[in-house]
């Protein structure tokens, strides 16, 4: 029971996490204009991994995609790559984990196979979560570096009468979504790995021993304790290591695309 619950919960948590990673990757608000020096700006800038946007006080919003590939900073390319790798690994992990779920029966699949698939998906979720956390952290570090650089520039060369305010950027909503989503995916992966251990206990086969009693010859053959799917008609002499209960619930969380435009 505990194993199935752990596996199911790990799957759901990872699903939510991956949906969050997809949402964060698509979001435009990775960095938002810092309003500390100009809280009453009539023009608000924010940027994502794929495009930058300007929202005017009039309500008009204009977004422009980064149509160049070579002209983009290497760090941004790296963040994009990390997020995409995270999504791909997470998606594959989800696909594998669906077949690995103990509550889903596919043919006469052995529990050892399900255990291997659970471990595989768990590792994929862990790597996916780490990719997302790394991607978001690299971007955040880039923002912090640029923020202090632009702050230094802002207070130098202001001898003239005309003041040119340099736009500074701070953390956007997508960073927090990414961190949380990455963390959830990581936790889900760990839960899947824990569930894997309970799914595949080592087989302990006891040799058949014959006890000869006078008058009767009765052979006691204790069946080897073996993990089973419980699938099929003959379940005699089989100990099912899932506590007997199964959940048929499938919790689905669809990736939501947050459009801030």
């Amino acid at each position: 029971m505990a194993v199935t619950a752990c596996q199911g919960l790990g799957f759901v948590v990872s699903l939510i996490g991956i949906a969050g990673i997809i949402a964060a990757t698509c979001m435009d608000q990775w960095s938002t204009q810092d309003l500390y020096n100009n809280p009453v700006t009539a023009v608000f800038n924010y940027q994502g991994l794929w495009r930058s946007c300007v929202r005017e006080s009039s309500g008009f919003t204009e977004c422009r995609g980064y149509f160049t590939l070579l002209g983009l900073p290497a760090m941004l390319q790296a963040v994009r790559a990390l997020m995409i790798v995270g999504i791909v690994l997470g998606a594959i992990g989800l696909l594998v984990s669906i077949f690995a779920l103990k509550c889903i029966r596919i043919g006469s699949m052995e529990d050892s196979a399900k255990a291997n698939m659970t471990l595989t998906s768990g590792i994929m979720f862990i790597v996916s979560g780490l990719c997302a956390i790394a991607g978001v952290s690299v971007f955040a570090n880039m923002l912090v570096t640029n923020f202090w650089m632009s702050t230094a520039n802002m207070y130098t060369g202001m001898g003239g009468m005309v003041q040119t305010v340099q736009t500074r950027y701070t953390f956007g909503a997508a960073l927090f979504v990414g961190w949380v989503a990455g963390g959830l995916t990581l936790i889900g992966g760990v839960m899947m790995c824990i569930a894997c251990r309970g799914l595949a206990p080592e087989e302990t086969n006891y040799k058949a021993v014959s006890y000869h009693a006078s008058g009767h010859s009765v052979a006691y053959k204790p069946g080897g304790f073996k993990a089973s799917t419980g699938f099929g008609s003959n379940t005699k002499n089989k100990k099912i290591y899932d506590g007997g209960a199964r959940t048929e619930d499938e919790v689905q969380s669809y990736p939501s695309k947050h459009d801030y435009v």
């Epitope: 009453v40 700006t41 300007v54 006080s57 009039s58 040119t164």
Partner: antibody, heavy 118, light 113 residues
Framework: EVQLVESGGGLVKPGGSRKLSCAAS????????MHWVRQAPEKGLEWIAH????????YYADTMKGRFTISRDNAKNTLFLQMTSLRSEDTAMYYC???????????WGQGTSVTVSS | DIVMTQSPSSLTVTAGEKVTMNCKSS????????????LTWYQQKPGQPPKLLIY???TRESGVPDRFTGSGSGTDFTLTISSVQAEDLTVYYC?????????FGAGTKLELK
Amino acid sequence: EVQLVESGGGLVKPGGSRKLSCAASGFTFSDYGMHWVRQAPEKGLEWIAHISSGSSTIYYADTMKGRFTISRDNAKNTLFLQMTSLRSEDTAMYYCARFVRGNALDYWGQGTSVTVSS
Amino acid sequence: DIVMTQSPSSLTVTAGEKVTMNCKSSQSLLNSGNQKNYLTWYQQKPGQPPKLLIYWASTRESGVPDRFTGSGSGTDFTLTISSVQAEDLTVYYCQNGYSYPLTFGAGTKLELK
């Protein structure tokens, strides 16, 4: 055709109050931010206040803050300007205007005149 | 607050002449996010409300004759009328659309020589 018609102007005593209205037609009022701008006789344009399409964001000129209140009723397609503690220097033609891209004011009403005098 | 300074305050011209008026802001109106300058030009005829001519410093509003051209970037802007017509002899205002409070220049008045 876009139309903005101001009303509520007139003669007011110093320290008095007045509520100006701006009736909008010919466009989806609830989609646009709106502004009040005034012009004293033989003087230039002076911005008063801005209200966003859903009334979530409001800005005032420092000199008018606390005395003037901008509001809107999207159901009635009407913009308002409540003016209190009026002074002689508030004598002007009051215009309402529609806010569009580029943070520009593309359509203006004909204006309503407010005279503050004892 | 951003201070808008227009020059000259008045300009005497003849019909058909090319006219240039200036507007200077105390702070840059160039937005780095879209590389657009948030400066607007208006024309106001006596007894009428202002009319939008140009926004984003150089984008002509629909219906505005192409003899009106806006230019400039950062803090220095210009409105040029390539061939002045009689109906153009009125007052022109520039406006900051970059930050609140939205501020207007004192205006440039075009008069017939």
